[in-house]
């Protein structure tokens, strides 16, 4: 485990949480649940009690917001960044964030409360069998009244358990209708209508008549939402599917992933996709928000990231339905505020004690690791020392392994990348990398494991670079790129993410290229790179000799030290000056003898 | 007691530059951000940026993006807002305003009048 | 960028209830929290509710504020001469923030 700098912590055990919104991914009391239930995860090992509030005066308040939400640290879009907390302390600190962008579900797809059928208002289970076929939403297969239900249990056909989903032709929402369904056909502005409408509306909301003429009557309600049935990207983002729809001639009652390779659920938003070709994707499992936060509240009440990836703090997401806290959780947390105190002895009960389940995380399915948030962004010292911005080093005792003499940096024939970060230079190997400060007689330190300090980060490495105002550091594997802000990581992210096309198969090294600019380089082609908005300009693509003459053509790193570009071939460099406006190399040599001043044995 | 205190009242000519300090006391400068809001007379509040004064990050209104420059100097618990190239119509008071899920202080505000 | 549209006027004689309402033009505020400020002449602005509904602490609990699909409302119950001011209601919108125009409450 990891805690901030001068272990930042509450010094009251009384601690008060506000939530100060919400998302429209969950109902409101899956959502409080969620967050209780994650705090008690915390309470249950620590003296700490967590009480709710409705004021912004609580230690901890918690948010959902999209991209720029107020902080300073913008969230990304959907995944990548998840969610962000501060460590603790007045203000800011303590607050937690959650990206609405994601899709927030308990970690086994969208929630979907039921109104009546026999369940007792239980959510959806998805998928569900019924009549020996698999649904992935609501659905009106077997009714003839058009009413959408689903099975609360994982098979209808052996369990008989159902309810029926949020649906207009069952209820409508606030308006001035006090709740009745929807009457299609309605008639407004003369026009007949048989389905929900944003029609005379700015907002985007859907509404529809309860009566057979709305401009007559004037009594209107909002259709409910159907996370279910929503979809995400293709062509009709934020519509519904519309079930049964036809597909290469044949009809669908539920999201298929036939015709496509990647196994993703998608559906048609018409009743015909061969006419009207109209689509999204289906909603998938989405993020646990009760995982999710519990993390988040670990760094709100003090802890940094784990190096244990079985940890609740490691910075990867992974769905789990064991017992969230690991050992190293617990060590971290009592760290801070010692163990829950034993209860009281008390007469003995009559009801026998449930056998409570082995500490340990089992995942249920393959641990896929998702990206994780860029949480815990911000001053590692205590708040007195005013900002420090997030921690650019990392863990300050960074795990040397025991040395043997593949680990001295000299023996390293080729490095996978080498980057100035801050104003040392940093050399990747193999998992490992060296630090070296230039000097008379000095020797690269280490080596240190990249695992301890960047745990994200796969063990080859292509190229890394510092973005010196923001302090960004980006690494480049194959297709993917990880960004750290201090120890807090966003990714993997796909090249293509940052606007590279699909032939670009690696980041062979970067280039400062004025303000909050970068060359990005690849093989032979080079393009210019705005860090800001993390985008190459397509424009920009140039061959790296027309810019930098004299350069091998075959380079595997380029770097830049000293306000000098690098080129790395083999075991060698050609260093390239710039003077009025012209690229010249000065100097070609050893990285080795001539940069790491290692001795010529 | 939680105060924000500007600095005085500037005249500029157009095309001139004006900053304008802001001073916090009374809570812990680095945990909250500093929004600034301006009123031109007899109309109504306009944002014009942001700054944490947490981390430095600034977030400007669309309009006044390479006009305005905001900064903190945690060192004296400071924010500058500076605003360039002055036209007549920037003439307005000058509001910081601490921010935190709503700006619950202001400062008193600085008159900032533009003329030849 | 969003607009938020108030009605630039209100009022009311002393005691009554006077409601001023805050829209969203081109994006949705039902979705996004409000703050509402008061601004009573020659001084800065207050914080007078901030996130829909919630009152710092010495705001008389005849304010109140609401916020369901696309409008947002600022409440003033049982109204009195010192209510006379300027009223902004203030939200997120992508990335910045959005002040209505402003509802000039006089008290009759």
């Known amino acids: 485990f990891q805690t901030f700098e001068g272990d930042l912590k509450w010094h009251h055990h009384n601690i008060t949480y506000w939530i100060q919104n919400y998302s429209e991914d969950l109902p409101r009391a899956v959502i409080d649940d969620a967050f209780a239930r994650a705090f008690a995860l915390w309470s249950a090992v620590t003296p700490l009690t967590f009480t709710r509030v409705y004021s912004r005066d609580a230690d901890i308040v918690i948010q959902f917001g999209v991209a720029e939400h107020g902080d300073g640290y913008p969230f990304d879009g959907k995944d990548g960044l998840l969610a962000h907390a501060f460590p603790p302390g007045p203000g800011i600190q303590g607050d937690a964030h959650f990206d609405d962008d994601e899709l927030w579900s308990l970690g086994k797809g969208v929630v979907v409360p039921t109104r009546f059928g026999n369940a007792d208002g239980a959510a959806c289970h998805f998928p569900f069998i019924f009549e020996g076929r698999s649904y992935s939403a609501c659905t009106t297969d077997g009714r003839s009244d058009g009413l959408p239900w689903c099975s609360t249990t994982a098979n209808y056909d052996t369990d008989d358990r159902f309810g029926f989903c949020p649906s207009e032709r069952l209820y409508t929402q606030d308006g001035n209708a006090d709740g009745k369904p929807c009457q299609f056909p309605f008639i407004f502005q003369g026009q007949s209508y048989s389905a929900c409408t944003t029609d005379g509306r700015s907002d985007g909301y859907r509404w529809c008549a309860t009566t057979a003429n709305y401009d007559r009557d004037k009594l209107f309600g909002f259709c409910p939402t159907r996370a279910d049935s929503t979809v995400m990207g293709g062509n009709s983002a934020g519509e519904l599917c519309v079930f049964p729809f036809t597909f290469l001639g044949k009809e669908y009652s539920t999201c298929t992933s036939e015709g496509r390779g990647d196994g993703r659920l998608w559906c048609a938003t018409t009743s015909n996709f061969d006419s009207d070709k109209k689509w999204g994707f289906c909603p998938d499992q989405g993020y646990s928000l009760f995982l999710v936060a519990a993390h988040e509240f670990g760094h709100a009440l003090g802890l940094d990231h784990s190096s244990v990836p079985e940890a609740l703090m490691y910075p990867m997401y992974r769905f789990t339905e064991g017992p969230p806290l690991h050992k190293d959780d617990v060590n971290g947390i009592r760290h801070l505020y010692g163990p829950r105190p034993e209860p009281e002895p008390r007469p003995p009960t009559t009801t026998t004690p449930q056998p409570t389940a082995p500490p340990t995380v089992c995942p249920t399915g393959p641990p896929t690791v998702h990206p994780s948030e860029r949480p815990t962004a911000g001053p590692t010292g205590p708040p007195s020392a005013g900002p420090t911005g997030p921690p650019t080093a990392g863990p300050s005792t960074a795990t040397t392994v025991p040395l043997s003499p593949v680990d001295d940096a000299c023996n390293v024939n080729i490095f996978d990348a080498i980057a100035e970060i801050g104003n040392q230079l940093y050399l990747f190997k193999d998992g490992k990398y060296w630090r070296f400060s230039e000097g008379r007689g000095s020797r690269p330190q280490g080596p240190f494991l990249i695992a301890d300090k960047w745990p994200a980060l796969p063990r080859k490495l292509d190229s890394v670079f510092e973005e010196r105002l923001s302090k960004k550091l980006f690494f480049f594997s194959g297709r993917q790129v990880w960004v750290y802000t201090g120890a807090s990581v966003l990714g993997p992210r796909r090249l293509d993410k940052l606007g590279l096309g699909a032939d670009v198969a690696q980041v062979t090294g970067a280039l400062r290229s004025g303000r909050g600019k970068m060359l990005l380089f690849s093989g032979r082609r080079l393009w210019r790179f705005d860090v800001k908005a993390q985008m190459v300009d397509p424009r920009s693509a140039s061959e790296v000799d027309r810019m930098f003459p004299g350069v091998p053509l075959d380079t595997h790193d380029v770097f830049q030290y000293r306000e000098k570009a690098y080129f790395c071939q083999d075991r060698f460099y050609w260093r390239v000056s710039s003077r009025s406006e012209l690229n010249q190399v000065d100097q070609v040599g050893y990285v080795t003898y001539d940069i790491l001043q290692c001795p010529e044995d | 007691e939680v105060q924000l205190v500007q600095s005085g009242a500037e005249v500029k000519k157009p095309g001139a530059s004006v900053k304008v300090s802001c001073k916090a006391s009374?809570?812990?400068?680095?945990?909250?951000?500093i929004s600034w809001v301006r009123q031109a007379p007899g109309q109504g509040l306009e944002w014009m940026g942001w700054?944490?004064?947490?981390?430095?990050?600034?977030n400007y209104a669309q309009k006044l993006q390479g006009r305005v420059t905001m900064t903190t100097d945690t060192s004296t618990s400071t924010a500058y807002m500076e605003l360039r190239s002055l036209r007549s119509d920037d003439t307005a008071v000058y509001y910081c305003?601490?921010?935190?899920?709503?700006?619950?202080?202001w400062g008193q505000g600085t008159t900032v009048t533009v003329s030849s | 960028q969003a607009v938020l549209t108030q009605p630039p006027s209100a009022s009311g004689t002393p005691g009554q209830r006077v409601t001023i309402s805050c829209s969203g033009s081109?994006?949705?505020?039902?979705?996004?929290?409000v703050n509402w400020y008061q601004q009573l002449p020659g001084t800065a602005p207050k914080l007078l509710i901030y996130?829909?509904?919630h009152r710092p602490s010495g705001v008389p609990d005849r304010f109140s504020g609401s916020n369901s699909w696309n409008t947002a409302s600022l409440a003033i119950s049982g109204l009195q001469s010192e209510d006379e001011a300027d009223y902004y209601c203030q939200a997120w919108d992508s990335s910045a923030v959005v002040f209505g125009g402003g509802t000039k409450v006089t008290v009759l």
């Open positions: 009374g809570y812990t400068f680095t945990s909250y951000g």
């Open positions: 081109t994006f949705n505020i039902g979705s996004n929290t």
């Open positions: 305003a601490r921010d935190y899920y709503g700006m619950d202080v």
């Open positions: 700054i944490s004064a947490y981390n430095g990050n600034t």
């Open positions: 996130s829909d509904s």
